[in-house]
């Protein structure tokens, strides 16, 4: 008789999760030779230890500490790109602008990007059927706690001008409940960060509105200003052209507004 298993509202652990994390770690250390000292088996063991045999609604940042101490690396603090609800474009951007970094360009972010995982209390099994949904089940689930922990430290590292890419097609361009709004904004260090520059990405080709005047952007400006960090905002009306101009800045069409 199969043992009763808790049914959660979210999708289960990504298939072949252990193999995927290990393979990504190996690939990352190959792409980044300066990280070749990283022991990927130790990384996986620490990752696994954070959630295996633990109730998936009772995960804490403490659980991830053995993983958090691994993979020390160098990210220029003035080349950090944060993003909210527009991950794909942010990643396309850093793939072209190789000297800028999103969290997913770092080892720990790269390992976990787009993956889901959870275990079960008192068993060493990984739950491939379902995992807790942040809204419907609980916020202290393995995936949410992981991203909260790594995002906080990434934001703490930033200096000078920090950029954030925001999705202008969303009803809340700046969402206080996003990882950016609830974690990263509050962990920028005012003594190191001079300016937060928001890039609001437009969705429609004919959309010529100044989305920097959006009430949620004004809310972001208020939060940032209260933290003694300057705020600036730019509309990116044509994201396709924006990327093209990052690739080919000498192009004559790149002098006009994008």
């Amino acid at each position: 008789v199969p043992r009763w298993r808790q049914q959660w509202s979210g999708p289960g652990t990504t298939k072949r999760f252990p193999e995927t994390v290990l393979a990504r770690c190996v690939k990352y250390t190959e792409i980044h030779p300066e990280m070749r000292h990283v022991d990927c088996q130790s990384v996986w063991d620490a990752f696994k230890g954070a959630f295996i045999s633990k109730h998936p609604c009772n995960i804490t940042e403490e659980d991830y500490q053995p993983l958090m101490k691994l993979g020390t690396q160098t990210v220029p603090c003035n080349k950090i790109l944060l993003w909210s609800r527009i991950k794909d474009l942010a990643h396309q951007f850093t793939q072209v602008q190789r000297d800028m970094f999103t969290l997913e360009d770092t080892l720990l972010g790269y390992l976990a990007d787009d993956l889901t995982w959870c275990g079960e209390f008192n068993t060493s099994k990984i739950n491939y059927q379902s995992c807790p949904d942040w809204r419907k089940d609980c916020s202290n689930n393995p995936v949410s706690v992981f991203w909260k922990t790594v995002s906080r430290r990434f934001a703490e590292a930033a200096c000078d001008v920090v950029h954030v890419m925001l999705n202008g097609s969303r009803s809340k361009i700046f969402d206080k409940n996003s990882t950016f709004g609830s974690v990263e904004v509050h962990n920028l260090q005012p003594e190191k960060v001079q300016t937060l520059e928001a890039w609001v990405i437009h969705g429609g080709r004919e959309d010529s509105r100044d989305l920097c005047q959006d009430p949620t952007i004004k809310e972001l400006e208020s939060i940032i200003s209260k933290r003694n960090i300057q705020f600036s905002c730019k509309n990116i009306y044509r994201p396709d052209k924006f990327l093209q101009c990052v690739k080919n800045p000498e192009d004559s069409s790149c002098t006009s507004e994008i």
């Epitope: 030779p33 300066e34 000292h37 940042e61 403490e62 500490q65 053995p66 958090m68 101490k69 020390t72 690396q73 160098t74 990210v75 220029p76 603090c77 770092t106 922990t149 906080r152 430290r153 990434f154 703490e156 590292a157 962990n187 260090q189």
Partner: antibody, heavy 120, light 108 residues
Framework: QVQLVQSGAEVKKPGASVKVSCKAS????????MQWVRQAPGQGLEWMGA????????TYNQKFKGRVTLTADKSTSTVYMELSSLRSEDTAVYYC?????????????WGQGTLVTVSS | DIQMTQSPSSLSASVGDRVTITCTAS???????LHWYQQKPGKAPKLWMY???NLASGVPSRFSGSGSGTDYTLTISSLQPEDFATYYC?????????FGQGTKVEIK
């Protein structure tokens, strides 16, 4: 604002022990290694050891052969460095310093230093 | 253990001079993990440059760093009065950590 505040100067006799504290604030205490570095008068920097408050992991400079003990109190965000069997050559300024995870392990914040004088 | 040797141990220079400090490792070091600190008398060291060439927050752009393998340099393009200090190179490794012996930059 990140701050590391160390305890005050100490004068000790040879053979005694000293315990120096370093209280951290303004960042997530658990997720950064804390290093201890000392500097004898007119000399360079010498690494003593490191502690990771998140899980209590510790690494020591073998030179100190069990004389140094590092501990962390997560409830007060404080790390401690105890050095035993003091000798005159342990007279130095002792620094705690945070290891920057995204700074390639560089020490991005330092305490103000604690002068320990060993004299009979 | 990898040793870090700085040269010169001290140097005298005038305001406006270009100054170069060298740090040589006894075996190869990843450029991502080679750092520099500035220390003034009676003060704690300050992170000055990390990952060979990245300036720490607030460090003036007249400072630059370069190098790979075993040889690294810190350069001040035009020495200013506030730059007179001792500079230490440092190689990150879990254990043991090693610092250079320091280079004292003095006023000529």
């Amino acid at each position: 604002q990140v701050q590391l505040v160390q305890s005050g100067a100490e004068v000790k006799k040879p053979g005694a022990s000293v315990k120096v504290s370093c209280k951290a604030s303004g960042y997530t205490f658990n997720t950064y290694w804390m290093q201890w570095v000392r500097q004898a008068p007119g000399q360079g920097l010498e690494w003593m050891g490191a502690i990771y408050p998140g899980d209590g992991d510790i690494t020591y400079n073998q030179k100190f052969k069990g004389r140094v003990t590092l501990t962390a109190d997560k409830s007060t965000s404080t790390v401690y460095m105890e050095l035993s069997s003091l000798r005159s050559e342990d007279t130095a300024v002792y620094y705690c310093a945070r290891e920057g995870y995204y700074y390639g392990g560089a020490l991005d914040y330092w305490g103000q230093g604690t002068l320990v004088t060993v004299s009979s | 253990d990898i040793q870090m040797t700085q040269s010169p141990s001290s140097l005298s220079a005038s305001v406006g001079d270009r100054v170069t400090i060298t740090c040589t490792a006894s075996s190869s070091v990843s450029s991502s993990y080679l750092h520099w600190y500035q220390q003034k008398p009676g003060k704690a060291p300050k992170l000055w440059m990390y990952g060979t060439s990245n300036l720490a927050s607030g460090v003036p752009s007249r400072f630059s760093g370069s190098g790979s393998g075993t040889d690294y340099t810190l350069t001040i393009s035009s020495l200013q009065p506030e730059d007179f200090a001792t500079y230490y190179c440092h190689r990150y490794h879990r254990s043991p950590w090693t610092f250079g012996q320091g280079t004292k930059v003095e006023i000529k």
